[in-house]
Interface confidence: low
């Protein structure tokens, strides 16, 4: 996954920046080699009214956010694009309460992709909104190296190869 500055999205805490503050996050290299140009505005489109948000059909609502759980399996980057095309993003977990909600709604014990990957530019784990992981709340089991992406299983976060195919969770 090639993303300029390692920052995929700029949406923070459910409120979007002014249009003048949007930045182009650069080209996303998808597994099949095609490239797409992604704007932060795409992500932020549905995030302006968290508390009164109406979730689309088949999406679950929790604390002002909407969640969609996949049944098929994709690589991390394909999962990322899938969510983005639906005006959402891969799951960003803010606290243990949200993690508990996610686990309650996962109907299988397999790994599930979330919106966290290791950016070689920053040499750190970064959520898809550009924020670093809060080590006081979460830690990642496994290698912290290039081409590592995060998946959850049983309330734990694991480092897995980004090309692995797992189910995923979209959020807006």
């Amino acid at each position: 996954l090639l993303v300029s500055q390692g920052v995929l999205l700029k949406c923070q805490k459910g409120s979007c920046s002014n249009a003048t503050q949007y930045e182009d996050t650069g080209d996303l290299k998808v597994n099949n080699g095609t490239r797409r140009n992604i704007s932060n505005k795409d992500l932020c489109a549905s995030r302006s009214a968290d508390q009164t948000v109406l979730c689309q059909s088949e999406w679950l609502k929790y604390q002002g956010k909407c969640y969609w759980f996949s049944n098929e399996m994709k690589s991390w980057s394909d999962s990322y694009v899938y969510c983005l095309e639906r005006k959402s993003h891969l799951l960003i977990i803010h606290d243990q309460l949200e993690m508990a909600f996610i686990q309650k709604n996962l109907r299988q014990l397999n790994y599930v992709w979330i919106g966290l990957n290791f950016t070689s530019l920053k040499m750190t784990w970064t959520w898809v909104d550009g924020s670093p992981i809060d080590s006081k709340i979460f830690f990642i089991k496994g290698p912290a190296k290039e081409n590592s992406c995060a998946a959850i299983k049983e309330s734990k976060i694991f480092s897995e190869t980004c090309s692995s195919v797992f189910k995923w969770i979209c959020q807006y």
């Epitope: 750190t124 080590s135 006081k136 830690f139 990642i140 089991k141 290698p143 694991f158």
Partner: antibody
Framework: SVEESGGRLVTPGTPLTLTCTVS????????MSWVRQAPGKGLEYIGI?????DTSYATWAKGRFTISKTSTTVDLEITSPTTEDTATYFC??????????????WGQGTLVTV | DYDMTQTPASVEVAVGGTVTINCQAS??????LAWYQQKPGQPPKLLIY???DLASGVPSRFKGSGSGKQFTLTISGVECADAATYYC????????????FGGGTEVVVK
């Protein structure tokens, strides 16, 4: 590097604090563990402190040990030592930052005799 | 609880031979297993992490394998310098554990 200190001969029931001093890396990004080894015995995990300061202990070690840290040191307090606590105490750093799973960097250990 | 059982407790091997050490977890730990070598008077040294990845500077004659509950450390072409005690360690769960480490295997090189 990591270096343990504070080991000495202590009488039973007298609290003792061991210190692990680190250099070359930041405790704000690495998890640190304490492991001990009684003479002629195997390795015994005591507990761990996360990069964020959270602690976790082996079941047998809860209440008997307290792990804390500053910006450059990790302390292990043996709250009320018994003769069974006689051992070499090692401080170890995880291989990965902001994670744990395997201990890559070890100190030489400090000997505690109760 | 995640208990680690290591076998054998001791093994003798001739120089140039092969030695196999087994480690069994009481519950599945995926691939979160490490192997260490310890010589008298020294701290442990990480050999293998994530079940099969060789730590930096470790000779390729050391090989880790397995996943789930069963793991193996194989030392091929044993050298005198390999005489040590070897420990496995689970890196999956740090809560409600008695010990992360197996009981150890002493390797004696003849």
């Amino acid at each position: 590097s990591v270096e343990e200190s504070g080991g000495r001969l202590v009488t039973p029931g007298t609290p003792l604090t061991l210190t692990c001093t680190v250099s070359g890396f930041s405790l704000s990004t690495y998890w640190m563990s304490w492991v001990r080894q009684a003479p002629g015995k195997g390795l015994e995990y005591i507990g761990i402190i996360s990069s964020g300061g959270d602690t976790s202990y082996a079941t047998w070690a809860k209440g008997r040990f307290t792990i804390s840290k500053t910006s450059t040191t990790v302390d292990l307090e043996i709250t009320s030592p018994t003769t069974e606590d006689t051992a070499t105490y090692f401080c170890a750093r995880d291989r990965n930052s902001n994670s744990w799973g395997s201990f890559y960097l070890w100190g030489q250990g400090t000997l505690v005799t109760v | 609880d995640y208990d680690m059982t290591q076998t054998p407790a001791s093994v003798e091997v001739a120089v140039g031979g092969t030695v196999t050490i087994n480690c069994q977890a009481s519950q599945s730990i995926n691939s979160w297993l490490a192997w260490y070598q310890q010589k008298p008077g020294q701290p442990p040294k990480l050999l293998i992490y994530d079940a099969s990845d060789l730590a930096s500077g470790v000779p390729s004659r050391f090989k880790g394998s397995g996943s789930g509950k069963q793991f193996t450390l194989t030392i091929s072409g044993v050298e005198c310098a390999d005489a040590a005690t070897y420990y496995c360690q689970q890196g999956y769960s740090d809560s409600d554990v008695e010990n992360l480490f197996g009981g150890g295997t002493e390797v004696v090189v003849k």
